[in-house]
Interface confidence: low
C-alpha cells in the first residue's frame, strides 16, 4: 500500500510568493512559493495519486505582515482552503499567547492540530480540551494512518505559552501515545512535529512503532541528487535512521518559508511495515502557476495589509540614525533600538537563578538599511520599518561559546573603515576596540550582561562559557563573513520576524528615544 | 544590680513581618520581625528577667504604606501596646513636619520621647513644651535609670523639622543634661539616640557620666560570635569604647527594620559603675511566634491599607536593588529605574533642535529606602513603591549651571564609604570617580546626554552651560548637604509625586528589567 506524504514546515507567514531568498517578491517572473502556487502543486498530486496526506510540521505563525495583521486567522483560512490533513504545533504558534492560538487557529481549523508532549493544567485544561490532540487517526483510502504530534520542549524559552502548559520531553511523551495507537490496531504511524532535525532523528531511533518522522524547526533541507536552488542539503531525502529495534525509519523536513513542498512516497506492507521510501522536496518556482481562485482570495486579504503598513505604530522624538555612515562605523541609535527590541521580545523569566535566559544581542550594521526621520511628527509606520529591515529576516536565538563571540567581535572590525556591513551593533554588551592593533587582536574589552543573576550587570566575557545571543538569522547562517558563528554555534532556534519584533516594541513603548550611550567604544 | 536593655532603632514602619531583606513578606514561613513577633520576645524576657527596659532609638516613622496611610498614629498605638519605656527622636520623625510629630505621636505616646539636643524656639516652644524631654528618670525595680536622648544634628538636612527647632551638637547638649542627672543622684545613665555609630562612639568617649549608649541612624549591626542572618557585623556587641575618663562604655545598635531585638545585659555596682556588659541582638525569625492579640490588632489596622495599594502596577523580572549597601556606594538598578522613570515623565518634544528639553536625572541614593524582590511573581504594587520612595516627595525640574552639577558630583563622594545618603544615582549622565584623589577633586569624567541634538549622545559637561535636570524636591531644597543646588539653581519647578512617576512608568512598561550598566564608574 502506497502513501504520498506532502509536507511543509516553518512556512512563517509566506502566504504570498517570495523572492528566491524568501524575502518580499520583487520580480514576479522569478518568484517562488506562496499558498496559491502550493495549492496548484498539491491538487496536481492529489489528482494523480490515490493516497495523499498534506501535513504541516508547525511554525505557520510569525514572519511577515500577514501574521502581524491577521494574527493567525490567515493561517486557518488558507490551510482550510488547501485542505491540510493535519498540523503539529510549532513554538511560534504560541507567540501571541495561548489565547492567540486558540481563537484564530484551534477554533477555526477544519483539520486536527496535534502535540502529544504539551499538557494543559489549571483553568486552561478544560478551556483547551479537544482543541488540540496528542494524535489523530486519519482514513486514507481503504487504510488508516495515525499521526502523532510533538513540539519543541524549549518552547517556554522561545515563545509565550504561559504558565498553564507543560512541555514534556518529546520521546517520553510520544511512546505511550504510539502504544495506544497500536492497541487501536493502527499499524501505520507518522510522527509529525516541530523540535528540530536532531530530535527528529532521536524520535526515529527511540520511539517504538513510529514509521515515518516529518519534522520542522531547524529549517533542514534534505535532497537526493542535484539540488534545484541555492539551499545546500544537510543529507539525503529521506534521511534514513536505523531504529533501536532495527527498522529503517525515514526522516524528512522541507526547508522553510513554503519554498518547497516535501514529497515522500512510502510503501507499506500489509502489516504496516515501511518497505520503501523515496522522494524529494519540490521547488515551488514560477514554472508552477499560482491557482487563480486562491490568488484572488490572497489579493482580497491583501488590502487590509496595505492600509496597516501606513498606520502609526508609535512615535520617536529622536532621529533614528540607521545611516551606513553611522551604523557601519560606530554605535548608532537605530542599532540600539533594534537590539533593545530583540531582547525585549525574548523575555522568558522561567527560573529564580536567571533574571532572563538571554541578555545579549548582536546585529550587523550592514543589515540596517535606512534611518527614520523624527520630523514627520515622530510617526513610525510598518512601512518605515520595512525600509530599515527590508530582508524579511528573523531574529533568532543561538548558543555560542565566549570564544566564538570574541572571534565575531574581532571580525566586526578586522577591516574597519571600509563601510562594510560586518560592524556589529549590540545590546547587553560593552565592547572596546583599539584600532591601532592588528586585525584579529583589536578587542581590548568585552563585557557582557549577566543572566544568572538577579540584578543584571556587566562582567568580562569568559572564553569557555556558553552564552545565549539574539541575532539576525543572516548572522546565524554565517552571513557578512561570520563563518565562525555558523561553524561553532551549539544551538540555533529561529525567532520572530525582524520587523514584527521592532514594531511590537515601538507599539509597546509608544514613544521612543534611543541614545548613543557608550555600548561601543574605541580606545 | 543587673539591667536588661532591650532596644530597637530605625524600624521604619515595619509593623508587619518582612522578608529577610526587610522588604514585604513573601513566604510567611521565612519572614522576620514585625511588632507581633517583637512583643512575643519582649514579653518572654520581661517574664524571665527582673529589670527590663524596652527602648527605641528613633526612626520609627517612614518606610512603608503603614506610615503613608496612618502617618505616625500606628507608631504610637503599637509602641503603646508593646509598652516601650522610652524613645529617642530620629530624623525621620520630622518627615511630616513638627505637626506630623506632635499630633499622632508626641500627644498619643504613653512613654517619654526624648532629645536633649533639640531646642524649640519661637511660637513652637510653648506648643511643644513637655511633649518631648531632654531626659527621663525611670524607676526600674528598686533602682532608677536616667535616659537622655539625642538626635542627629543633620536632621535639618535630612527631614522637615521647620525653622523653630534648633539641632545642637550632640555632645555639647548632652553633657549638661547628664550633669543634671548626676546632681539628682541618678548614677546609671543611658544615652539613647539617633545620630549614627560614629557619633554614638564619640558620645561614649566624651560625655562624662554616660554609662551605656544605645544608638541608631546608621543601621549598624554589631554581633559577638557567628551572625545568624545576612548582616555582616561592624564590630562586637556591645562595642566597647574607653571614655576619656577611663571607663569602658558599651555602645549598641540593632541594625534596622525591626529584624533584631537588641539585648544587652549590664551589671552595675552599688555606685552605678558598669562592671560587666554582654549580649547580642536577637534575630526575630519565624522560630518566634507572632503574638496573637497584637497580630489580630495588626490585621484590623491592615484592612485600610489593603484597599489603598495592593493592585499590580506591572512586573519586574529582576531584583530591584534599592539596598543602602548598593545605592549609597555604587550604581544600583533601582536608581536607574527611578531616574529612567523621571526622564520618561518629562518628555516634552517641543523643538526640532532639541530632542527633549531635559535629559538628566540625579537622585540621592539615601532617598531609595527599600529593594523590591522579584520573587513574588514579579508583582510591583503601589505598596512596594511606597517602601522604596516613602517620603511623599516630588520629582522636580531645575535649571543649573554645569559648575553647580560638578560641585554636586564632588559632594556625592566627598566622604565616600560611610553609607551616607548623598551618593548620587543618575540618568542621562556618565560619571567616573577617582577616590584616591582628595575630596572636592574626585570627579575625573562627567559626560551628559545632549538635549540640543537629534540623536542623544554623551558630551563632556560644560561649566558655563545651563542644564535642565530632574531631581527629587529634597535635593532641590538642598537636602543631604546639596547646599550648592539650593544656592545656585536658576529655576525650580515642582513636579509630580515620586511614587506616581515611577508607578506610571512601570504601568506603561508592563515588564521592567533595569540593569547596572556603567552610568557610574570608579577609575
Amino acid at each position: 500500500w502506497e502513501l504520498t506524504i506532502l509536507h511543509t514546515n516553518d512556512v512563517h507567514s509566506r502566504l504570498e510568493q517570495t523572492s528566491e531568498d524568501s524575502s518580499k517578491c520583487v520580480n514576479a517572473s522569478r518568484c517562488m512559493g506562496g499558498v496559491a502556487r502550493l495549492f496548484t502543486k498539491v491538487q496536481q498530486i492529489r489528482r494523480a495519486e490515490p493516497n495523499v496526506l498534506l501535513l504541516d510540521a508547525g511554525d505557520q505563525y510569525q514572519g511577515t505582515i500577514w501574521f502581524t495583521v491577521y494574527k493567525g486567522a490567515e493561517v486557518a483560512h488558507f490551510m482550510n482552503a488547501l485542505r491540510y490533513d493535519a498540523m503539529a504545533l510549532g513554538n511560534h504558534e504560541f507567540d501571541n499567547g495561548v489565547e492567540g492560538l486558540i481563537e484564530p487557529l484551534l477554533k477555526e481549523a477544519k483539520f486536527p492540530i496535534l502535540s502529544a508532549n504539551i499538557k494543559a493544567k489549571g483553568p486552561l485544561a478544560s478551556q483547551i480540551s479537544g482543541l488540540y490532540l496528542p494524535y489523530k487517526v486519519l482514513p486514507v483510502g481503504d487504510e488508516v494512518v495515525g499521526i502523532v504530534g510533538y513540539t519543541s520542549k524549549e518552547t517556554p524559552f522561545l515563545s509565550n505559552p504561559g504558565t498553564n502548559l507543560v512541555f514534556e520531553d518529546e520521546i517520553t511523551a510520544l511512546q505511550p501515545e504510539v502504544d495506544k495507537l497500536k492497541t487501536l490496531n493502527v499499524n501505520k504511524i507518522i510522527a509529525l512535529g516541530h523540535s528540530g532535525f536532531e530530535t527528529d532523528k532521536l524520535i526515529a531511533q527511540k520511539v517504538r512503532g513510529v514509521d515515518v518522522v516529518v519534522g520542522g524547526h531547524s529549517n533542514t533541507f534534505l535532497y537526493t541528487g542535484n539540488p534545484p536552488s541555492k539551499e545546500v542539503p544537510a543529507g539525503k531525502y529521506p534521511f534514513i535512521v536505523t531504529s533501536d529495534d532495527g527498522r529503517k525509519v525515514p526522516v524528512v523536513q522541507a526547508y522553510a518559508f513554503g519554498k518547497y513542498l516535501g514529497y515522500l512516497k512510502i510503501e507499506f506492507d500489509e502489516r504496516g511495515n515501511v518497505i520503501s521510501s523515496h522522494g524529494n522536496p519540490i521547488l515551488l518556482n514560477s514554472s508552477i502557476p499560482e491557482d487563480p481562485s486562491i490568488k484572488a482570495d490572497i489579493n482580497k486579504w491583501r488590502i487590509k495589509l496595505d492600509n496597516y503598513s501606513t498606520q502609526e505604530l508609535g512615535k520617536t522624538i529622536v532621529y533614528l540614525d540607521g545611516s551606513s555612515q553611522s551604523c557601519r562605523f560606530r554605535e548608532c541609535n537605530m542599532g540600539n533600538l533594534i537590539c533593545d527590541a530583540m531582547i525585549n521580545n525574548n523575555l522568558r523569566h522561567a527560573d529564580e537563578m536567571f533574571w532572563n535566559h538571554v541578555s545579549m544581542c548582536i546585529l550587523n550594521g550592514g543589515g540596517i538599511r535606512s534611518p527614520i526621520d523624527e520630523r514627520n511628527n515622530g510617526t513610525i509606520t510598518w512601512e518605515n520599518l520595512a525600509a530599515v529591515l527590508p530582508f524579511g529576516g528573523t531574529f533568532d536565538l543561538v548558543q555560542l561559546k565566549g570564544s566564538t563571540l570574541k572571534k565575531a567581535f574581532e571580525h566586526s572590525v578586522h577591516r574597519y573603515g571600509q563601510s562594510t556591513g560586518e560592524f556589529l551593533q549590540v545590546g547587553g554588551i560593552h565592547v572596546v576596540y583599539d584600532l591601532s592593533r592588528k586585525p584579529g587582536d583589536r578587542v581590548v574589552k568585552l563585557d557582557v550582561l549577566c543572566t544568572k543573576c538577579r540584578v543584571p550587570s556587566y562582567d568580562p566575557l569568559k572564553m569557555d562559557e556558553i552564552y545565549k545571543v539574539i541575532l539576525p538569522n543572516f548572522l546565524a547562517n554565517g552571513g557578512d563573513g561570520f563563518q565562525m558563528i555558523k561553524d561553532e554555534l551549539l544551538r540555533h532556534d529561529s525567532g520572530d520576524q525582524d520587523i514584527n519584533v521592532v514594531s511590537t516594541y515601538i507599539s509597546k513603548m509608544k514613544v521612543i528615544y534611543p541614545a548613543v550611550e557608550g555600548r561601543i567604544k574605541f580606545s | 544590680w543587673e539591667l536588661t536593655i532591650l532596644h530597637t532603632n530605625d524600624v521604619h514602619s515595619r509593623l508587619e513581618q518582612t522578608s529577610e531583606d526587610s522588604s514585604k513578606c513573601v513566604n510567611a514561613s521565612r519572614c522576620m520581625g514585625g511588632v507581633a513577633r517583637l512583643f512575643t520576645k519582649v514579653q518572654q524576657i520581661r517574664r524571665a528577667e527582673p529589670n527590663v527596659l524596652l527602648l527605641d532609638a528613633g526612626d520609627q516613622y517612614q518606610g512603608t504604606i503603614w506610615f503613608t496611610v496612618y502617618k505616625g498614629a500606628e507608631v504610637a498605638h503599637f509602641m503603646n501596646a508593646l509598652r516601650y519605656d522610652a524613645m529617642a527622636l530620629g530624623n525621620h520623625e520630622f518627615d511630616n513636619g513638627v505637626e506630623g510629630l506632635i499630633e499622632p505621636l508626641l500627644k498619643e505616646a504613653k512613654f517619654p520621647i526624648l532629645s536633649a539636643n533639640i531646642k524649640a524656639k519661637g511660637p513652637l516652644a510653648s506648643q511643644i513644651s513637655g511633649l518631648y524631654l531632654p531626659y527621663k528618670v525611670l524607676p526600674v525595680g528598686d533602682e532608677v535609670v536616667g535616659i537622655v536622648g539625642y538626635t542627629s544634628k543633620e536632621t535639618p538636612f535630612l527631614s522637615n523639622p521647620g525653622t523653630n527647632l534648633v539641632f545642637e551638637d550632640e555632645i555639647t547638649a548632652l553633657q549638661p543634661e547628664v550633669d543634671k542627672l548626676k546632681t539628682l543622684n541618678v548614677n546609671k545613665i543611658i544615652a539613647l539616640g539617633h545620630s549614627g555609630f560614629e557619633t554614638d562612639k564619640l558620645i561614649a568617649q566624651k560625655v562624662r557620666g554616660v554609662d551605656v549608649v544605645v544608638g541608631g541612624h546608621s543601621n549598624t549591626f554589631l554581633y559577638t560570635g557567628n551572625p545568624p542572618s545576612k548582616e555582616v557585623p561592624a564590630g562586637k556587641y556591645p562595642f566597647i569604647v574607653t571614655s576619656d575618663d577611663g571607663r569602658k562604655v558599651p555602645v549598641v545598635q540593632a541594625y534596622a527594620f525591626g529584624k533584631y531585638l537588641g539585648y544587652l545585659k549590664i551589671e552595675f555596682d552599688e555606685r552605678g559603675n558598669v562592671i560587666s556588659s554582654h549580649g547580642n541582638p536577637i534575630l526575630l525569625n519565624s522560630s518566634i511566634p507572632e503574638d496573637p492579640s497584637i497580630k489580630a490588632d495588626i490585621n484590623k489596622w491592615r484592612i485600610k491599607l489593603d484597599n489603598y495599594s495592593t493592585q499590580e502596577l506591572g512586573k519586574t523580572i529582576v531584583y530591584l536593588d534599592g539596598s543602602s549597601q548598593s545605592c549609597r556606594f555604587r550604581e544600583c538598578n533601582m536608581g536607574n529605574l527611578i531616574c529612567d522613570a523621571m526622564i520618561n515623565n518629562n518628555l516634552r518634544h517641543a523643538d526640532e533642535m532639541f530632542w527633549n528639553h531635559v535629559s538628566m536625572c540625579i537622585l540621592n541614593g539615601g532617598g531609595i529606602r527599600s529593594p523590591i524582590d522579584e520573587r513574588n511573581n514579579g508583582t510591583i504594587t503601589w505598596e512596594n513603591l511606597a517602601a522604596v520612595l516613602p517620603f511623599g516627595g516630588t520629582f522636580d525640574l531645575v535649571q543649573l549651571k554645569g559648575s553647580t552639577l560638578k560641585k554636586a558630583f564632588e559632594h556625592s563622594v566627598h566622604r565616600y564609604g560611610q553609607s551616607t545618603g548623598e551618593f548620587l544615582q543618575v540618568g542621562g549622565i556618565h560619571v567616573v570617580y577617582d577616590l584616591s584623589r582628595k575630596p572636592g577633586d574626585r570627579v575625573v569624567k562627567l559626560d551628559v546626554l545632549c538635549t540640543k541634538c537629534r540623536v542623544p549622545s554623551y558630551d563632556p559637561l560644560k561649566m558655563d552651560e545651563i542644564y535642565k535636570v530632574i531631581l527629587p524636591n529634597f535635593l532641590a531644597n538642598g537636602g543631604d548637604g546639596f547646599q550648592m543646588i539650593k544656592d545656585e539653581l536658576l529655576r525650580h519647578d515642582s513636579g509630580d509625586q515620586d511614587i506616581n512617576v515611577v508607578s506610571t512608568y512601570i504601568s506603561k512598561m508592563k515588564v521592567i528589567y533595569p540593569a547596572v550598566e556603567g552610568r557610574i564608574k570608579f577609575s
Epitope: - | E352, F354, Q399, R491
Partner: antibody, heavy 120, light 106 residues
Framework: EIQLQQSGPELVKPGASVKVSCKAS????????MYWVKQSHGKSLEWIGY????????SYNQKFKGKATLTVDKSSSTAYMHLNSLTSEDSAVYYC?????????????WGQGTLVTVSA | DAVMTQTPKFLLVSAGDRVTITCKAS??????VAWYQQKPGQSPKLLIY???NRYTGVPDRFTGSGYGTDFTFTISTVQAEDLAVYFC????????FGAGTKLELK
Amino acid sequence: EIQLQQSGPELVKPGASVKVSCKASGYAFTSYNMYWVKQSHGKSLEWIGYIDPYNGGTSYNQKFKGKATLTVDKSSSTAYMHLNSLTSEDSAVYYCARGYGNYKAWFAYWGQGTLVTVSA
Amino acid sequence: DAVMTQTPKFLLVSAGDRVTITCKASQSVTNDVAWYQQKPGQSPKLLIYYASNRYTGVPDRFTGSGYGTDFTFTISTVQAEDLAVYFCQQDYSSLTFGAGTKLELK
C-alpha cells in the same frame, strides 16, 4: 556672527500700511522665535508678538492683534511685520529681536530698529 | 499679564556712585526677569537674565537680584559709559517691560 538687519525708515500717511523686514544671518533661522518690539519716542518698550519661523505659528500681544501681522520667508531667512491702518500712535521705532537660547525671551540679539513715521 | 513697575524714572549720578533700580511685578514672575541697557540711538542690550545672571561680556559691576515680585538692579561703581536708559522685563506671564530708568550726570 549673529545679525538681524532691518529695512530702512518709512514715512507713511495715516490709514496706509507698512511692511518692515528683518533679515537674519549667522544662525539656524528656523530654530528660534523672532520677536517684534515697539518703542515710541522717549517711551518704554512694548512687545508686539512673535513668530516661529519653523511652522509660521504666531503669538500676539492683545493690544496689537489686528494691527500687526507677522510672517516669514524661510528661503531668505527673513521675518516681516505688516502694520495696517496706521495712525500717529503707530509712529515709533520697531525692533526685531531674537532670544538668548530658545527657552526664554531674553533678547540678546536686536535689529538696528526701523523708524516708522506716520504723518499727513 | 504681569505689570512691571520700575522706579525711579530718573537718576542723577556721578562717576563712582552706587546705583540701585527696582522693579516690582504685579504678580509673581518667579525669576523670569531680564535687565537691558539702551543708549541713545542704539538698540537695547541684554545685561542680566534669570534675575541675577550676567550675560556674556557684561562687566561684573552690573548685578541683579530678586525672586517673585521684587527685583533689584545695581551698578556698583557707575562709569561714564553707563549713562543710558535701563529697562526690566518679565516673560513669565506674557511679556512686559518696565517704564525705564534714565541715568544722567549730576
